[in-house]
């Protein structure tokens, strides 16, 4: 691990906050054809919001209305399905929130069909038990992956049954997916109902649909793929963490810091302290004291939380979560306000607002 040894009385230079990315899977908004859909961009303090669909800039039109942090789609059609993103550009950073829109007729999607857990996977073709295609495991068809790091491999699967045995074909963004559509093409294994794309790149982003059909019917399922290009960067700290906290004397408090980093990060919790009655050194930088740092026996989860037990007035002040790797350092700060215990008259002055 790269080491950033901050000890008491060291100073910390502020760095530009990084761009923040959504790490978890996106929410899915479902609408039936013809319905209207309204989605609010779930980002705080958004000065300017821009929208994209499947990685392409999204502007207003006769059916798409963009008002502030809201996106409205009137008279939705299946073509409106896809991976949407809103990006909030602020003066100090930018943040992107992803969500998916799925405009589909529940019956044609096949996702809601009553199904066994695969007991009927291999119905004999020459039996009289004719059956339209069906998914062998509808629960697994719910799972979609938000993002895959570039240079890795993606595997789409749509295991299905039916009699006669259905055939499978693939679409990308609603159009026939051909080998020449991507460098290196793709590989299909019909016996495993799977398609593989090796060494994915950002241009592979989009909606991939498997269409499974026989003479008795057709079902389809769409996967939404985002490809993330990872370049080395200093740690990314989750927006809004640590959050300001307040407690009474004798109470307990915790600060949480979520760190995302390509290179292994070194995380420290720091308290801004006074020396000789001053919070700042001759160079104008703050005096700091390391409260907690990652050690040999400390897990990442443990270091992400700072607990302060039996709080005193001296604990009030500014706390900083600092994360460094071989590329650089990032930090977020929050304030702890300590209030007198009930029944005590002594007051404490209000603490400053959240600082980053």
């Amino acid at each position: 691990r790269p080491s950033f040894s901050l000890v008491e009385d060291t100073t910390l230079e502020p760095e530009e906050p990084p761009t923040k990315y959504q790490i978890s899977q996106p929410e899915v908004y479902v609408a039936a054809p013809g319905e209207s859909l309204e989605v609010r961009c779930l980002l705080k303090d958004a000065a300017v919001i821009s929208w994209t669909k499947d990685g392409v800039h999204l502007g207003p039109n006769n059916r798409t209305v963009l008002i502030g942090e809201y996106l409205q789609i009137k008279g939705a059609t299946p073509r409106d399905s896809g991976l949407y993103a809103c990006t909030a550009s602020r003066t100090v950073d930018s943040e992107t929130w992803y969500f998916m829109v799925n405009v589909t007729d529940a019956i044609s999607s096949g996702d809601d069909e009553d199904d066994t857990d695969g007991a009927e996977d291999f119905v004999s073709e020459n039996s009289n038990n004719k059956r339209a295609p069906y998914w062998t495991n509808t629960e697994k068809m719910e799972k979609r992956l938000h993002a895959v790091p570039a240079a890795n491999t993606v595997k789409f699967r749509c295991p299905a049954g039916g009699n006669p045995m259905p055939t499978m074909r693939w679409l990308k963004n609603g159009k026939e997916f051909k080998q020449e559509h991507r460098i290196g093409g793709y590989k299909v294994r019909n016996q495993h109902w799977s398609l593989i794309m090796e060494s994915v790149v950002p241009s592979d982003k989009g909606n991939y649909t498997c269409v499974v059909e026989n003479e008795y019917g057709s079902i389809n399922h769409t996967y939404h793929l985002d490809v993330v290009e990872r370049s080395p960067h200093r740690p990314i700290l989750q927006a809004g963490l640590p959050a300001n906290a307040s407690t009474v004397v004798g109470g307990d408090v915790e600060f949480v810091c979520k760190v995302y980093s390509d290179a292994q990060p070194h995380i420290q919790w720091i308290k801004h302290v006074e020396k000789n009655g001053s919070k700042y050194g001759p160079d104008g930088l703050p005096y700091l004291k390391v409260l907690k740092a990652a050690g040999v026996n400390t897990t990442d989860k443990e270091i992400e939380v700072l607990y302060i037990r039996n709080v005193t007035f001296e604990d009030a002040g500014e706390y900083t979560c600092l994360a460094g790797n071989s590329i650089g350092i990032s930090f977020h700060s929050a304030w702890l306000t300590v209030l007198p215990a009930p029944g005590r008259e002594k007051e404490i002055t209000a603490s400053p607002d959240y600082l980053e």
């Epitope: 790091p149 570039a150 240079a151 890795n152 491999t153 595997k155 295991p159 593989i196 990872r230 292994q264």
Partner: antibody
Framework: EVQLVESGGGLVQPGGSLRLSCAAS????????ISWVRQAPGKGLEWVGR????????NYADSVKGRFTISADTSKNTAYLQMNSLRAEDTAVYYC????????????????????WGQGTLVTVSS | DIQMTQSPSSLSASVGDRVTITCRAS??????LAWYKQKPGKAPKLLIY???FLYSGVPSRFSGSGSGTDFTLTISSLQPEDFATYYC?????????FGQGTKVEIK
């Protein structure tokens, strides 16, 4: 051309420590991962552990957990295997291998495949 | 841990022969199985991943099949450079585990 070059092997006494390096070139280091695999003389392959260079996460075989540590320096495109409390049974040729994920969108796991391997470095633990 | 058992442990064959190696997992690994080839004193090389997908640059005489617990590596027409030891490996369970290897020797 993708290349992985291991170094740092040698003779060490039981209880001792050794650090192996794996210098990588020819690919975007932070996109994939590095696995360490060892092979005792005349024996089969044994997976030791893996680091995902994108998020810094690591996984280890039970036989080395708590004794071995995998890390990486992305600025040098180099992965490391720090081996402490070495035992005679750790004697083996140690390989590093580029490891990429097959992200299966149907199930909730990622299959890990080792597609490029280094030439190996011999570690001998003996008194 | 998931145990991977290969059979046979060794086999003798001639150039041009069709060779089949099997690998059995102690529990379901879906299609999360790879095959590697290793020559003496050399590092292993990836042949097949996801049970049946041929890795780039690997000759088409190699093929893989199976899912769940039973897998097969087939060499349709054995070539001189194919005499080596072959390993299967699963990565759906932790830890990743290899089979004990199958040595293909010249008859």
């Amino acid at each position: 051309e993708v290349q992985l070059v291991e170094s740092g092997g040698g003779l060490v006494q039981p209880g001792g420590s050794l650090r192996l390096s794996c210098a990588a070139s020819g690919f975007t280091f932070t996109s994939t991962g590095i696995s360490w695999v060892r092979q005792a003389p005349g024996k089969g392959l044994e997976w030791v552990g893996r680091t995902h260079l994108g998020d810094g996460s690591t996984n280890y075989a039970d036989s080395v957990k708590g004794r071995f540590t995998i890390s990486a320096d992305t600025s040098k495109n180099t992965a490391y295997l720090q081996m402490n409390s070495l035992r005679a049974e750790d004697t083996a040729v140690y390989y590093c291998a580029r490891t990429y994920g097959i992200y299966d969108l149907y199930v909730d796991y990622t299959e890990y495949v080792m597609d490029y391997w280094g030439q190996g470095t011999l570690v001998t633990v003996s008194s | 841990d998931i145990q991977m058992t290969q059979s046979p442990s060794s086999l003798s064959a001639s150039v041009g022969d069709r060779v089949t190696i099997t690998c059995r997992a102690s529990q379901d690994v879906d299609t999360s199985l790879a095959w590697y080839k290793q020559k003496p004193g050399k590092a292993p090389k990836l042949l097949i991943y996801s049970a049946s997908f041929l890795y780039s640059g690997v000759p088409s005489r190699f093929s893989g099949s199976g899912s769940g617990t039973d897998f097969t590596l087939t060499i349709s027409s054995l070539q001189p450079e194919d005499f080596a030891t072959y390993y299967c490996q699963q990565s759906t369970g932790h830890p990743q585990t290899f089979g004990q290897g199958t040595k293909v020797e010249i008859k």
